[in-house]
């Protein structure tokens, strides 16, 4: 099946201090390689989460990514702060032959708006 990375929500709004879920699904796990979430684009983009076993504070996977047929790579960001605002991209990589993995497809992005906490 042809690989497609889908981020269904163009934007989400969340109150500061709350949690939000950023959805991402794939149509294929091939070619093999990791899935990562970034905020922003280009050289300055920030790695938010990687499905490769590392620990990321405040960010967790929603589904059981250890299922060998898992296609859901959604994440939950907890205790959101204004600094978390921005556009988040779910990115599929192809493993590299003894070199850095190659980005092969990105979702369309989900913009996160952080609302002031109601007083």
């Amino acid at each position: 099946k042809e690989l497609k990375v889908t981020q269904p929500e163009k934007s989400v709004s969340v109150a500061a201090g709350d949690s939000t879920v950023l959805n991402c699904t794939l149509t294929s796990l091939l070619p093999v390689g990791p899935i990562k979430w970034y905020r922003g684009v280009g050289q300055s983009r920030l790695l938010i989460y990687s499905f490769t076993g590392e620990h990321f504070p405040r960010v967790t996977n929603v589904s059981d990514a250890t299922k060998r047929n898992n296609m859901d790579f959604s994440i939950r960001i907890s205790n959101v702060t204004p600094e978390d605002a921005g556009t988040y991209y779910c990115v599929k990589f192809q493993k590299g032959p003894s070199e850095p993995d190659t980005e092969i497809q990105s979702g369309g992005g989900t913009e996160v708006y952080v609302l002031a906490k109601p007083s």
């Epitope: 093999v32 990791p34 059981d64 250890t66 299922k67 060998r68 493993k95």
Partner: antibody
Framework: DVQLVESGGGVVRPGESLRLSCAAS????????MSWVRQAPGKGLEWLAG????????YYIDSVKGRFTISRDNSKNSLYLQMNSLTAEDTAVYYC???????????WGLGTLVTVSS | ALTQPASVSANPGETVKITCSGG??????YGWYQQKSPGSAPVTVI????KRPSDIPSRFSGSASGSAATLTITGVRVEDEAVYYC???????????FGAGTTLTVL
């Protein structure tokens, strides 16, 4: 330190059953997929079965499908392998192994010996 | 099936390369496992093609290209004498496979 300790091996007759256990410590067991691998006397390593972190998804090599069942109890940090209808060909050292994110292995137990003999 | 040589030998200080072929680079990740004696616990020396666990010496390295993976031991030592198994995880079939093992003899 990550530690995996298998138990439950022993001598059984052909056709009998055995349940192996693997006690895990030193890591968040409920976050990792796990596998069972065996080694028959004088032979190489053979992957048998794997299970997802939550326990809902299981995977088997064809030769044990229907006879062996992998399961886990995350509340007890334990992995299991139920083996039914054992034959002499199942005689081996059985290892549990922790899986990496891409379903290879990073940590192994010391193994437990299963002998099937009449 | 993954294919690796039955045996290799080297003198201390030499570089040893053990190959493992038969996987599909598009769908396979490789790992390498060291077993010093039959029935003893395997030790992971490489996983994810080229990732070395923190407690494994830097003389061990891994690579994968095309349909093959390679374990390289640079400056082999007597204590590296063991059987080395390659393994593959196939993302098409969700199945793990081991090679038959390569016996490394350090002369």
């Amino acid at each position: 330190d990550v530690q995996l300790v298998e138990s439950g091996g022993g001598v059984v007759r052909p056709g009998e059953s055995l349940r192996l256990s693997c006690a895990a410590s030193g890591f968040t067991f409920s976050s990792y997929a796990m596998s069972w691998v065996r080694q028959a006397p004088g032979k190489g390593l053979e992957w048998l079965a794997g299970i997802s972190a939550g326990g809902s998804d299981t995977y088997y090599i064809d030769s044990v499908k229907g006879r062996f069942t992998i399961s886990r109890d995350n509340s007890k940090n334990s992995l299991y392998l139920q083996m039914n209808s054992l034959t002499a060909e199942d005689t081996a050292v059985y290892y549990c192994a922790r899986e990496t994110w891409n379903h290879l292995f990073d940590y192994w137990g010391l193994g437990t010996l299963v002998t099937v003999s009449s | 099936a993954l294919t690796q040589p039955a045996s290799v030998s080297a003198n201390p200080g030499e570089t040893v390369k053990i190959t493992c072929s038969g996987g599909d680079w598009y769908s396979t990740y490789y790992g390498w496992y060291q077993q010093k004696s039959p029935g003893s616990a395997p030790v992971t020396v490489i996983h994810s093609d080229d990732k070395r666990p923190s407690d494994i010496p830097s003389r061990f390295s891994g690579s994968a290209s095309g349909s093959a993976a390679t374990l390289t031991i640079t400056g082999v030592r007597v204590e590296d004498e063991a059987v080395y198994y390659c393994a593959g995880y196939d993302g098409r079939t969700y199945i793990n496979t081991f090679g038959a093992g390569t016996t490394l003899t350090v002369l």
